[in-house]
């Protein structure tokens, strides 16, 4: 099966790499613009230069192209705790990330929020915090994992999943209650 090509891809595939088909004359292949520039005017004829102009401040192109406009620079989302790792340049978009000891939680493919890495209090670090994943904690005896925090088994209600992990403690509490009734 041949993958479906869009009109632009079809047109480009007729020309050698680094060139594109003139939109008004399909017998002409024009040289693509370098990254950091955009297409101002198509080449007037074979072997003649494409008119490429540098992207203005606040815009960029990250690869060779024949775009009529540069792309707008992304802005880091302060409300999501993001910080700017590197500024936008004419040939590279803004790079956003998180502060030290934080990880990214992706709400969607393009939208992430920064959260503090768990410290594993009352437990030990099983897997260290990574760029896109929180620390994985293992809890000490007498504690159970709830929302990635080690919580005392005294907070474990019988109806909750923690009963398996806190079984000895729950039995002790039950035993104390029973002995109090005699």
């Amino acid at each position: 099966l041949v993958p479906h090509l869009g009109d632009r891809e079809k047109r480009d595939s007729v020309c050698p790499q680094g060139k594109y088909i003139h939109p008004q004359n399909n017998s002409i292949c024009c040289t693509k613009c370098h990254k950091g520039t955009y297409l101002y005017n198509d080449c007037p004829g074979p072997g003649q230069d494409t008119d490429c102009r540098e992207c203005e401040s606040g815009s960029f192109t990250a690869s060779e192209n024949h775009l009529r406009h540069c792309l707008s620079c992304s802005k880091c989302r302060k409300e999501m705790g993001q910080v700017e790792i590197s500024s936008c340049t004419v040939d590279r978009d803004t790079v956003c990330g998180c502060r030290k000891n934080q990880y990214r939680h992706y709400w969607s493919e393009n939208l992430f929020q920064c959260f503090n890495c768990s410290l594993c209090l009352n437990g030990t670090v099983h897997l260290s915090c990574q760029e896109k994943q929180n620390t994985v904690c293992t809890c000490h005896a007498g504690f159970f994992l709830r929302e990635n925090e080690c919580v005392s088994c005294s907070n474990c209600k019988k109806s909750l999943e923690c009963t398996k992990l806190c079984l000895p403690q729950i039995e002790n509490v039950k035993g104390t209650e029973d002995s109090g009734t005699t």
Partner: nanobody, 122 residues
Framework: EVQLLESGGGLVQPGGSLRLSCAAS????????MGWARQAPGKGLEWVSF????????YYADSVKGRFTISRDNSKNTLYLQMNSLRAEDTAVYYC???????????????WGQGTLVTVSS
């Protein structure tokens, strides 16, 4: 058919509290990020909060941080918004939404409830 039904709105004095609920049906609730948005009279839609499918991650708008708490009960297919220290500027219609993260970044709206009105006034 996806249905989201909000309740719990009403008239409350400044400094008071309300708890909004959103009963969901017609889809596997525990698989979806859910959220709350609001629209004040004559203003645009504002994202208030959202929560991921297992309740581990939450987002709050700066305007409600420390006052509002989002939570969910996947066993009851219900989303909640606990609103404390309410202010006049919190007056709005509050909407429950499925997959709010997409609407947040690109105004692609999936499923919304009909809204519940919260009025903060003395």
């Amino acid at each position: 058919e996806v249905q989201l039904l909000e309740s719990g709105g009403g008239l409350v004095q400044p400094g008071g509290s309300l708890r909004l609920s959103c009963a969901a049906s017609g889809f596997t609730f525990s698989d979806y990020t859910m959220g709350w948005a609001r629209q004040a009279p004559g203003k645009g839609l504002e994202w208030v909060s959202f929560i991921d499918s297992d309740g581990l991650h939450t987002y709050y708008a700066d305007s409600v941080k420390g006052r509002f708490t989002i939570s969910r009960d996947n066993s009851k297919n219900t989303l909640y918004l606990q609103m404390n220290s309410l202010r006049a500027e919190d007056t709005a219609v509050y909407y429950c939404a499925q997959n709010p993260q997409y609407a947040y970044e690109s105004s692609r709206f999936d499923y919304w409830g009909q809204g519940t009105l919260v009025t903060v006034s003395s």
